[in-house]
Interface confidence: low
């Protein structure tokens, strides 16, 4: 029986009965928040072999192993992941081992096993046999291995039953529990699965099979399942569904999508039966099961019952996410907020058309209206008193409307009104008149030349860069010394810079009046020598990364109608030099014959330039005789191995560890102080842990149903 679309077992352990007849869970499996320790021994689900999404275990009291619950769980496909993970075991207070002795494959995603105080048998599992890449696995905060004394079957009797593999240069037995080995297939099978008797399965099988070389005997399919057979691709007139099986059109037509979305049924697109058209596509008619590409952003019409939608917070803006046409009026009143510009862009950035009017008032948190980055038409079908369809009043920090060089905005009907926007230059308003086609509609009092721009540098001169020099992580720039009418009024310069993969940034991107700014800022004092050009060294930059840079002069002078005269540069785009790439990731090697090694790896996370080739070096190594000198299966303390440089694991030091020379010949040494990079890595690690934990809590704690 296929169960789904996701099974959430919480609070009452007897809910586990829901899994009784499941062979495949099409979706996720959550087992969580069971606070009363129960006896799980009577619960056993041998039918369950595949979970198509992920398995999450969280705070289940009394559960000591998963092996009895899911003795035949073979594959977790990871079609959808929980925060990049296909297996999450978190804060399982009584779990002693994972014990999923038949788990052979996690197709996509990593594992996260964290804060399980009693959990052992983690170092005895070779996850590289189950996952393609182990570098993203996160296994921390569990029972320290030294307190575990993990022993694989037979090692105490000196008749080891399990096979060995190498993990982190340690060649050891691999097992799930004290009596269950980790299954490995003969090397002759290559990437193929195998039966319990070590016969190779059909190439289309995944995990295991009940008979060799038979595509109808697979426990799970490598690609897709159709009519009892594992197939590399879905046959004609069938469609991929949920990442693992093939269904026909009739099946797809009769699935209704989840209640709270627009339930128009599933669609068939690109050979797949899916809940809705993918990004960039739209249904070919409301009753259609097929998708066609959108021209530009896909249209989504949003309507406000009360005609006027007030945007006074991120929450209210959230309601407009994805909307391209807004039927009604927008009243924007953002007095404060955190990271408001980018949040508003996130939720309102797709709006192209407003059918009524747009009013922006008392929005002291706004520096620019660029968050409405796709607005191209205000129809003005409904107007404010006085026939205004664009009304901007009392916005103390508004400096820019839009970047008019890259913006086409039409106001079809109605006038514009601007008053009490002290940082908004009148020239900016006049430019809007021209672009929007409203020039001549406004009467004299509609654009107040006294109280708009009264506290802004409206008459800007252009600062010119004179030189730029780059290295892998530095940029040196200089610019002409700016001379205002009275040079004593030039206070300093401010340099703004940020990463800019594309040459499309504007001065006001991500900027609001509450401190959020996507630009890094550096103040540059005037050189004391009047003949020296001002400049700056920007350091700590990333190699082979394009940065956008501009400079502003900070001045005092009040001239011409009491307006401040200032100066700023154009935005300069400049790329740092290439550098040595970081190390290639997930290096795996396997022997496929007595004279060949197959080596695979993933590209480095930081290429720091255009990668042109890889260098692979290898050398023959002698067998390490040291491995044979100690009985590793005994529970005695393993002797400390003296490494060539005299350093040892800091935890092994019991005598006085202090020596004057770190790493010298005098014996054990102190831990060297942490480098800045290590401290930063630790900080990021702690931050990442917090982010994950927040994500976990937000995902699983839900209000009680009615």
């Amino acid at each position: 029986e296929i169960c789904g679309p996701g099974i959430d077992i919480r609070n009452d352990y007897q809910q586990l009965k829901r899994l009784e007849n499941c062979t495949v869970i099409e979706g996720y499996l959550h087992i969580l928040l069971i606070s009363k320790a129960e006896d799980y021994r009577s619960y056993r689900f041998p039918k369950l072999t595949v979970i198509t999404e992920y398995l999450l275990l969280f705070r289940v009291a009394g559960l000591e192993s998963l092996g009895d619950l899911f003795p035949n769980l073979t594959v977790i496909r990871g079609w959808k992941l929980f925060y990049n993970y296909a297996l999450v075991i978190f804060e399982m207070t009584n779990l002693k081992d994972i014990g999923l002795y038949n788990l052979r494959n996690i197709t996509r995603g990593a594992i996260r096993i964290e804060k399980n105080a009693d959990l052992c048998y983690l170092s005895t599992v070779d996850w590289s046999l189950i996952l393609d890449a182990v570098s993203n696995n996160y296994i921390v905060g569990n029972k320290p291995p030294k307190e575990c004394g993990d022993l694989c079957p037979g090692t105490m009797e000196e008749k080891p039953m399990c096979e060995k593999t190498t993990i982190n240069n340690e060649y050891n037995y691999r097992c799930w529990t004290t009596n269950r080995c980790q299954k490995m297939c003969p090397s002759t099978c290559g990437k193929r699965a195998c039966t319990e008797n070590n016969e190779c399965c059909h190439p289309e099988c995944l995990g295991s099979c009940s008979a060799p070389d038979n595509d109808t005997a697979c426990v799970a399919c490598r690609h897709y399942y159709y009519a009892g057979v594992c197939v590399p691709a879905c046959p004609p007139n069938t469609y991929r569904f949920e990442g693992w099986r093939c269904v026909d059109r009739d099946f797809c037509a009769n699935i209704l999508s989840a209640e709270s979305s627009d339930s128009e049924g599933f669609v068939i697109h690109d050979g797949e039966c899916m809940q809705e058209c993918p990004s960039g596509f739209i249904r070919n008619g409301s009753q259609s099961m097929y998708c066609i590409p959108c021209e530009g952003p896909c249209p989504k019409v949003c309507e406000e019952e009360k005609k006027t939608k007030t945007i006074d917070s991120v929450t209210s803006a959230q309601m407009l996410q994805g909307c391209t046409i807004f039927k009604g009026n927008l009243l924007i009143n953002i007095r404060r907020g955190n990271n408001i510009a980018s949040e508003l862009e996130n939720f309102m950035g797709l709006i192209e058309v407003v059918t009524g009017y747009v009013k922006i008032r008392h929005s002291h948190a706004l520096v620019s209206l660029s968050f409405l980055k796709n607005l191209r038409l205000i129809l003005g079908e409904e107007q404010l008193e006085g026939n205004y369809s664009f009304y901007v009043l009392d916005n103390q920090n508004l400096q820019q409307l839009w970047d008019w060089d890259h913006r086409n905005l039409t106001i079809k009907a109605g006038k514009m009104y601007f008053a009490f926007n002290p940082k908004l230059c009148v020239s900016e308003i006049y430019r809007m008149e021209e672009v929007t086609g409203t020039k001549g509609r406004q009467s004299k009092g509609d654009i107040n030349t006294r109280n708009n721009g009264e506290r802004a540098s409206c008459e800007s001169d252009v600062l010119h860069f004179t030189s730029t020099t780059t290295s892998k992580n530095r940029i040196i720039i200089t610019w002409h010394r700016y001379r205002p009418p009275d040079y004593r009024d030039l206070i300093s310069f401010t340099v703004y810079y940020k990463e800019a993969p594309f040459k499309n940034v504007t001065e006001y991107d991500g900027q609001d009046a509450c401190g959020s700014n996507s630009w890094n800022m550096v103040d540059v004092d005037l050189p004391p020598n009047k003949d020296v050009e001002p400049g700056i060294l920007l350091h700590g930059l990333k190699p082979w990364t394009q940065y956008a840079v501009y400079v502003k002069a900070v001045t005092l002078t009040m001239v011409e109608n009491d307006h401040i005269r200032g100066a700023k540069s154009e935005i300069l785009y400049i790329r740092t030099n290439a550098s040595v790439p970081s190390i290639p990731l997930d290096v795996l090697s396997a022997s496929n014959s007595s004279s060949q090694l197959i080596v695979k790896w993933n590209p480095p996370s930081l290429p720091n330039g255009n990668l042109s080739y890889y260098i692979v070096r290898w050398q023959r190594q002698p067998q390490d005789g040291y491995l044979y000198r100690h009985n590793y299966c005994s529970k005695d303390k393993i002797p400390i191995r003296k490494y060539a440089d005299g350093t040892i694991d800091i935890e092994e030091v019991t005598e006085n560890p202090k020596t004057e020379v770190c790493g010298g010949e005098k014996g054990p040494c102190c831990a060297c102080p942490k480098t800045e990079a290590e401290k930063q890595a630790e900080k990021e690690e702690a931050e990442y842990r917090k982010v994950f934990e927040n994500f976990l809590h937000n995902s699983i704690f839900v209000p009680r149903p009615e």
């Epitope: 169960c3 679309p5 037509a253 699935i255 209704l256 999508s257 209640e259 339930s263």
Partner: antibody, heavy 121, light 107 residues
Framework: QIQLVQSGPELKKPGETVKISCKAS????????MNWVKQAPGKGFKWMGW????????TYSDEFKGRFVFSLETSASTAYLLINNLSNEDTATYFC??????????????WGAGTTVTVSS | DIQMTQSTSSLSASLGDRVTISCRAS??????LTWYQQKPDGTVKLLIY???RLHSGVPSRFSGSGSGTDYSLTITNLEQEDFATYFC?????????FGEGTKVEIK
């Protein structure tokens, strides 16, 4: 508690129109689909269709396309069934039923008490 | 449309009896079978969905089974409140269709 309260019985003449209401209480109307089911005297049920209470989009079974209209008044947490141009065959009890989406299917976990419509000249 | 057939339109049973009601679909409905109970006063209640899953609050004496086209509802240890009409409904293919019903009467 969760319940669907339907309007009272109706006696109509052929050719007239009837509008039946179904008021939801104890839950948010927009979170669940609302279905309409017909039961002729002494017969089984016939599913007439459903309305997506989130979007207001109705879906009608082929047999009930044309004269039948599903609608909503979200602010009043009420769903309506309108039957135009009544005929004797429309004599039946009409149930509203809240549906739960279950893995590609839909089942009806809360039912109204039914509204009896009698069409007679 | 998929036809749902409840071959027995009525059956008589005594308190404490075990009763099985069958339902056949005109084609495979992939276990998407639901059972409802209608009391003599007309009130309808959901009993079982997806062939065998007991709706919350339904007594455990009700159980469902079947696959493909043949399904059944079993009531063990029949109680007074169980005398009613039982309908099956398929949820595999639109339009959803119901059986004609099986009335369980007191012997």
């Amino acid at each position: 508690q969760i319940q669907l309260v339907q309007s009272g019985p109706e006696l109509k003449k052929p050719g007239e129109t009837v509008k039946i209401s179904c008021k939801a209480s104890g839950y948010t109307l927009a979170n669940y689909g609302m279905n309409w089911v017909k039961q002729a005297p002494g017969k089984g049920f016939k599913w007439m269709g459903w309305i997506n209470t989130n979007t207001g989009k109705p879906t009608y079974s082929d047999e009930f396309k044309g004269r039948f209209v599903f609608s909503l008044e979200t602010s009043a947490s009420t769903a309506y069934l309108l039957i135009n141009n009544l005929s004797n065959e429309d004599t039946a009890t009409y149930f509203c039923a809240r549906s739960i989406y279950y893995y590609g299917s839909r089942y009806f976990n809360v039912w109204g008490a039914g509204t009896t419509v009698t069409v007679s000249s | 449309d998929i036809q749902m057939t409840q071959s027995t339109s009525s059956l008589s049973a005594s308190l404490g009896d075990r009763v099985t009601i069958s339902c056949r679909a005109s084609q495979d409905i992939n276990n998407y079978l639901t059972w409802y109970q209608q009391k003599p006063d007309g009130t309808v209640k959901l009993l079982i969905y997806y062939t065998s899953r007991l709706h919350s609050g339904v007594p455990s004496r009700f159980s469902g089974s079947g696959s493909g086209t043949d399904y059944s509802l079993t009531i063990t240890n029949l109680e007074q409140e169980d005398f009613a009409t039982y309908f099956c409904q398929q949820g595999n293919t639109l339009p959803w269709t119901f059986g004609e019903g099986t009335k369980v009467e007191i012997k």
